[in-house]
């Protein structure tokens, strides 16, 4: 599914980093880990030191400030989670610094963060019906729902 073209005129301005060094566990209690330089995957870990630690940066939309829009960065790196298309793995994109302003095609760096109880969902701003998801024997990807797992638990203060 192509990104919604009407999003291109919405500007997202960086506010600040709101979370540092947290781990994402899916509903099967699998942690997100690095698969390789480009991709992420999920695995059941005995030692959470092997899990990817993320930072979360908050953005404000020029269109509506009531929604929580975030960027996900691997802690202590310049690698950012980037959406592709449905059922495609999310990519790790290297950037010299966190973008101060995001608009147009760059919205594949942004996610709507929704919490409900202990569940956390990350919907792609570029693909509003797709979530960051884990899938058995596959990389972390964008998916619309089952059989992929779209809800995550945030484990904080793991550093």
């Amino acid at each position: 599914s192509a990104p919604f073209s009407f999003l291109s005129n919405v500007k997202y301005n960086f506010m600040r980093i709101i979370k540092y060094e947290f781990i994402l566990n899916d509903a099967l209690n699998q942690s997100i880990i690095r698969a390789n330089d480009q991709y992420l995957t999920a695995a059941a870990l005995h030692n959470l030191d092997e899990a990817v630690k993320f930072d979360m940066g908050a953005y404000k939309s020029s269109k509506d400030d009531a929604k929580i829009t975030v960027i996900l960065r691997i802690s202590k790196t310049q690698l950012y989670v980037t959406a592709q298309d449905e059922d495609q793995p999310v990519l790790l994109k290297e950037m010299p610094e966190i973008p101060k302003t995001i608009t147009g095609s760059e919205t594949n760096l942004l996610f709507f963060w929704e919490t409900h109880g202990t569940k956390n969902y990350f919907t792609s701003v570029a693909h509003p019906n797709l979530f960051i998801a884990t899938k058995q024997d596959y990389w972390v990807c964008l998916a619309g729902g089952p059989p992929s797992i779209t809800d995550f638990q945030i484990l904080e203060n793991q550093a």
Partner: antibody, heavy 118, light 113 residues
């Protein structure tokens, strides 16, 4: 699962202030919005305001802008709602709620009855 | 502020029959960027705090019986109880959380006929 426990009933004089606390057990407010809602006797629900601690952002209904203060302690386990310049029509049950980073309530406190009477 | 208007104010339905409550917002609560309707439904029984039934207009909260369903988009929403049970007697409220201040409907009282 987060449980919200509110402070006890209060009887206040007109013109005074009341501060109601809302303690989260089994979790913290870190990832959540906190909303405060009141219900006058026999009436419906009225949204007073809320806070998203992670953003340090507070929102108020216009009617309460000047006399409502919403805060959260540093441990992110207790929220407070202070209403000043109380009037008899502020007599109501005051509820805190949380559980999402949007302003809807998944978990609710038991309510705190505030009576304003001379 | 967005005004939420519920209809009817009260409703008497026979046990096992369908109950339908409508909620209309004075402006759209659909956020086009993520295709979500920022609307919730609550049930409140006397002496108790409200209980969340539905959020995002149609997502049923865990543990809520499947006879409760939410539908609608934009400005017009419906809460349906497909087969009314005695324990469903309560006041039901819709709430928009699209923009602040968040606002509630005035409530609909559901009784047994």
């Amino acid at each position: 699962q987060v449980q919200l426990v509110q402070s006890g009933a209060e009887v206040k004089k007109p013109g005074s202030s009341v501060k109601v606390s809302c303690k989260a057990s089994g979790g913290r407010f870190t990832n959540y919005a906190i909303l405060w809602v009141r219900q006058a006797p026999g009436q419906g629900l009225q949204w007073l305001g809320g806070i998203i601690p992670i953003f340090d952002e507070t929102d108020h209904a216009q009617d309460f802008q000047d006399r409502l203060t919403i805060t959260v302690d540093e441990s992110m386990t207790t929220a407070y709602m202070e209403l000043s310049s109380l009037r008899p029509e502020d007599t109501a049950i005051y509820y805190c709620a949380t559980g999402s980073n949007s302003y809807y309530g998944l978990y609710w406190g038991q309510g705190t009855l505030v009576t304003v009477s001379s | 502020d967005i005004v939420m208007t519920q209809s009817p104010d009260s409703l008497a339905v026979s046990l096992g029959e369908r109950a339908t409550i409508n909620c209309k917002s004075s402006q759209s609560v659909l956020y086009s960027s993520n295709n979500k309707n920022y609307l919730a439904w609550y049930q409140q029984k006397p002496g108790q705090p409200p209980k969340l039934l539905i959020y995002w207009a149609s997502t049923r909260e865990s543990g809520v019986p499947d006879r409760f369903s939410g539908s609608g988009s934009g400005t017009d929403f419906t809460l349906t109880i497909s087969s009314l049970q005695a324990e469903d007697v309560a006041v039901y409220y819709c709430q928009q959380y699209y923009s602040t201040p968040s606002t509630f409907g005035q409530g609909t009282k559901v009784e047994i006929k």
